[in-house]
Structure formats: structure tokens, C-alpha cells
Amino acid sequence: AGVFELQIHSFGPGPGPGAPRSPCSARLPCRLFFRVCLKPGLSEEAAESPCALGAALSARGPVYTEQPGAPAPDLPLPDGLLQVPFRDAWPGTFSFIIETWREELGDQIGGPAWSLLARVAGRRRLAAGGPWARDIQRAGAWELRFSYRARCEPPAVGTACTRLCRPRSAPSRCGPGLRPCAPLEDECEAPLVCRAGCSPEHGFCEQPGECRCLEGWTGPLCTVPVSTSSCLSPRGPSSATTGCLVPGPGPCDGNPCANGGSCSETPRSFECTCPRGFYGLRCEVSGVTCADGPCFNGGLCVGGADPDSAYICHCPPGFQGSNCEKRVDRCSLQPCRNGGLCLDLGHALRCRCRAGFAGPRCEHDLDDCAGRACANGGTCVEGGGAHRCSCALGFGGRDCRERADPCAARPCAHGGRCYAHFSGLVCACAPGYMGARCEFPVHPDGASALPAAPPGLRPGDPQRYL
């Protein structure tokens, strides 16, 4: 495992009187960003497979505005390196494509506009762990200067990042037959004995006794070429004899998405989110122009007519993605307010509002009690987005239409018995208690804890709660 690193040194007009003006203007300020795509470079098949080694996108560079009358200088660049991590062995020979993109920051309808300024490509031999290699390339009227290197991630070392280094077990020297790990002289090369019979061309190991396969090979000894035709199902055949890659425990293991696409698991398999310029189940289709009809779901394609010109899909409402291939789950943004139910009808969004709310997004709070009648003498109380009736005695329910059983809630305390009455309820209190709900104890000396009972009522008589 390791990282390919790309450093862009300059991007500007080539020499000579025909050099281009700046790609940015006072009217249209812009900024640059870069994309790198890496492929293993040995076989033609590998070279044709898009970005099989990985891809990366730089940050946006500083905003640049052309100074009228001044010659176009080298343009301001994004900070930092472009880094493409690789999981397996570094192939030694690789192909690259470096694209320079312009992001226009003028008053664009629908956000910034992107256009491809330049694309350079090449195939190079490069040993991991070596020094930075420099390059100068022309693309149209532009000149790009860059450096690149591949470096191993510890504990991997070596020109292909397949050897491992381990801390020394003894302070003075490495074990028998083992060399110090340059440049980490305080570490020793780990003894790596791959599984017996592991293909020296197509297999390697990072742990003794294992046999890991380079891309395009499978089987216990990496001797079986992968047959893509019988392996289209992400959980398809997995035996070595069928020549299919054995998938990991999850459908996104090993990232099946090419060209820097990102993988997300779905209930049945996986889904690739592709960068602009690529589409297909695994982002494997590239070199696309508007003539190829890359925009799905009625998206409008804008761009050049040849493979060197980028295209952009302007998606209709309800779709997104570089090729308008993804239906927007617009309800996930919870556009319906006040607890409204969201319905995505494809061509439009609908909100089904809760009582008391209205408007396209249920944003209007209605007068809850307007036009609402509470039956049987109940009174309407506003609040919480829905009307509520405060019912007269003996009635309940949302609109006070239901005759209530006043004794259902056992309102009489201390063993008092409840009697339903036309005007409410009456509690017959147990000896020693009094009050409308039998809530007060009667003192032994006959005095009540409360003011004297109303005339005509003796303690112990059923108290009527009016």
C-alpha cells in the first residue's frame, strides 16, 4: 500500500506570440482545479480501464481576475498535493491523465460553470520510494509543469511497496539473512515467504504464507485471470475455478467504482457516485461527449463535441448526479413544516398538512378555532397547531360529542364511591373523609380541617361536587 503524489508547479500560457489570454477576465473571475487519473500501464487492456489505480481532485485554487493589458502569467494554483492512495502493489509502469479545470465564478445561472482547459497524458516508469520525477507538457496553448512520486505507507517498503519493515528485535543487528530497511536503518526487512506456488508475476504477499492477487487475477495462487463477464453480480460466483474475483464481506469492499467514484451500499448491492465525465454501473464509461447522450432523466447536456471537451448535465427538478442519474430524495430534506407529510411525486413535491396548517410547505398556521365548533357547550382552545375543546361536564372527545363516564378515572379518594350524576359525578366518602373528592380527613373531635361544611350537609354525607 502507498500513495501516489502529484505536485502541480505551474499552469500558464506556453511561450510565443500566440500564447492565450488568461482564462479568467474582470467580468468572469475564475479559479483552477486539477484532476488526476491513474491506470496501471503495462497492458493495453489495463491502460483502457479507466482510473483503475485511482483518481483525485485538487482543492480549488485562489480566485483570479485578469488584469487588463497585462500578459497572462502563470495562474494561481491550489495548495497542496494531489494524493491517490493505492491499496496493493505499485505497478512500476503507470499511465496518467491530468486535467486542468476552470471554475467560472461570474453570475452563472445555477451556480458555477466548469470547463476543461487542458488535458495531458503519459505513460511512465516509476519506482516507489524514488525521488520526485518532473514533467513539462503542452496542451493546446497551455503549458503544465508538475512533479510526481509514489511512496509506500509503512510498514511497506521497496520499489513496489510489497516488502515489509519491522522494528528490530535486537538493538544491534537484523536477524539471519535479513537486511536493514533503507532508509529506516533502525528497522529490519521482514521475512516474507509467500504461500507456496503463489504466482511471482500476478501475486504478492504482505504477510508470510499469504498470496494476494494483483488486479485482474484471482485464485488461491493468483494464476486465474479474472473473467468479468461471469462476475457482473456483485455477489456473484466466487470460486477460483470460475475466474471471478472473490468479493469481500461487503459489496463496497475493494471499491468497485472506477475513476474515483465513491461506493455506497444499497440493500441489494452497491451504488457508485461517479465524478463528472464518467458514468455506468461502476463509473467505467468515459471519453463521453454530448453526442453520447450521457444525461439521464431528461437532463440537458452542455459541452463540447469531442472527447477532449467536458460536458455538463443540467438536471431537471428531482434528479441529481453528474449524469442526472440519481433521483433526489427531496423528502429527506424535510421540506414540510409543522409535521406535514412529504410526498415526492417525481414531477413535484406535495406536503400533506396536519390540521391547523396550510400552504405548499404547511408553513401557514391557521386560526385553529376558526370554523371549529365544540359540541355540548364545550369551548375551543387554540394551541399547538390543532384546536382543542375543553368539554362541559359529562362530555369528552375531540369535539365534546362523546358522553363521558365521569367515574372512569376513579376520582374519589380514600375508598370513596363514585356515582355518575346528570351534572357530573358525586363521591360517597368512606367514614373519616370528606370533600368533593373525599380528599380531606375528618378530625376526631368533629372539626374539619377546612371551613365548616355548608349548612345541611353533615360530615359523612355524600358530598356533591358542583
Epitope: E48, A121, R123, I136, A139, D308
Partner: antibody, heavy 117, light 107 residues
Framework: QVQLQQSGAELAKPGASVKMSCKAS????????IHWIKQRPGQGLEWIGY????????EFNQNFKDKATLTADKSSTTASMQLSSLTSEDSAVYYC??????????WGQGTTLTVSS | DIQMTQSPASLAASVGETVAITCRAS??????LAWYQQKQGKSPQLLIY???SLEDGVPSRFSGSGSGTQYSLKINSMQPEDSATYFC?????????FGGGTKLEIK
Amino acid sequence: QVQLQQSGAELAKPGASVKMSCKASGYTFTRYWIHWIKQRPGQGLEWIGYINPTTVYTEFNQNFKDKATLTADKSSTTASMQLSSLTSEDSAVYYCARGGSNFFDYWGQGTTLTVSS
Amino acid sequence: DIQMTQSPASLAASVGETVAITCRASENIYYNLAWYQQKQGKSPQLLIYTANSLEDGVPSRFSGSGSGTQYSLKINSMQPEDSATYFCKQAYDVPPTFGGGTKLEIK
């Protein structure tokens, strides 16, 4: 204007070595690489290698790895190529050219090497 | 190394005629193709780079096109001063390699 001025014709014996030069002017010498190209009489063109004057890094066509040595002197803005163990197969016109990896935009006038006993 | 096959090896054209020279690469070179003109006794001169970009100072009657493995150089309205040998060169891989050349003469 950009110019690459190459040294004069060379006559050498088989087994000997020869060193030819390429003086650059009219541009910043360290900004571009100097490539060397061989052309035998009535034949096509064959890339030998290049030197990056900034880093003095060199890269060669495998066919010339043991034949050519490339150097560059920033102070005199001059690139040089030494050819060793000469044989009659090395008789050719040798060009230096300014460029990057995918263009050679200015060429010297060429140095003719004749290897004869 | 990538092989470059140029055709025809030679041709003659009249003044004002349109001329086309083709170059085929042994594998995809991703537009990394340049065309050079070499007049008798002179050093080569860059005409076209990255398949279709015209070098500064080169007359607009010269144009380049192509993609993948097939590329061509076109001269619209041949002029006497266009008599020369034309070479294609791939720069996708190291070492860069040249075609065998096409000798263009005036009729």
C-alpha cells in the same frame, strides 16, 4: 529569439569518445529540458535522452544508456553530450532540442559525427 | 517501445493541392502526437503538437487531427516551400519514437 547553437563537425576513430555541445540563448535555460536526437544519413530520427538543466536529472532511451552521457552547465547555459566507444554505427547528425516531454519546439542546427579509421 | 508507422513514404503534389499524411501508433497514444517538418540539409521544425495544436509561426494551411492510434497531417493548398520530409512523433510513452518519415515533393 530562442537559439540553440551546436558545436562543429567531429571526426573520430572507432573506440574513441567525442563530446559535442549545445549553447542555449534567448530564454531561461533552466525552464526547459534539452533533448538529444540522432539522425543517420537518409534515415529517420531516434531520441537519445534528455537532461533537465535545473536538477541535472537525465533520462535515456535504453539503446543509448551505455553510449551517451549528458551534462548541463547553468552558468554557461550549455548542454553537452559525450558519446563513448564509437563505432561506424554512431556516424550521424546529432541534434539538441529544447522542450518538455511532449514537444521539441526549437532545434539546434546539428553536429555531424563521422567515425572512421 | 511504441511503433509509429507513417504513410505514404513519399508523394508528389501540385501547388494548391490538398495533401494528407497519416501516422498509425502501435497502441493508443492519447493525442500525444507531434508533427515535424525537415527541409533538405536543415534541422526539423515543430509544426503540430498534441495532435491538433498549431505551433506559433506555422502557416494555418497545416492542420492535425486524429485520436487513439490514427493521426493525420493535412496541408491545405500545397506551396512550393512545403517540399520537405515530415515526421510524426509519439510522446505518450518514454522513449518518444518517430515515424519513418514522408518525403513530400512538388509536382
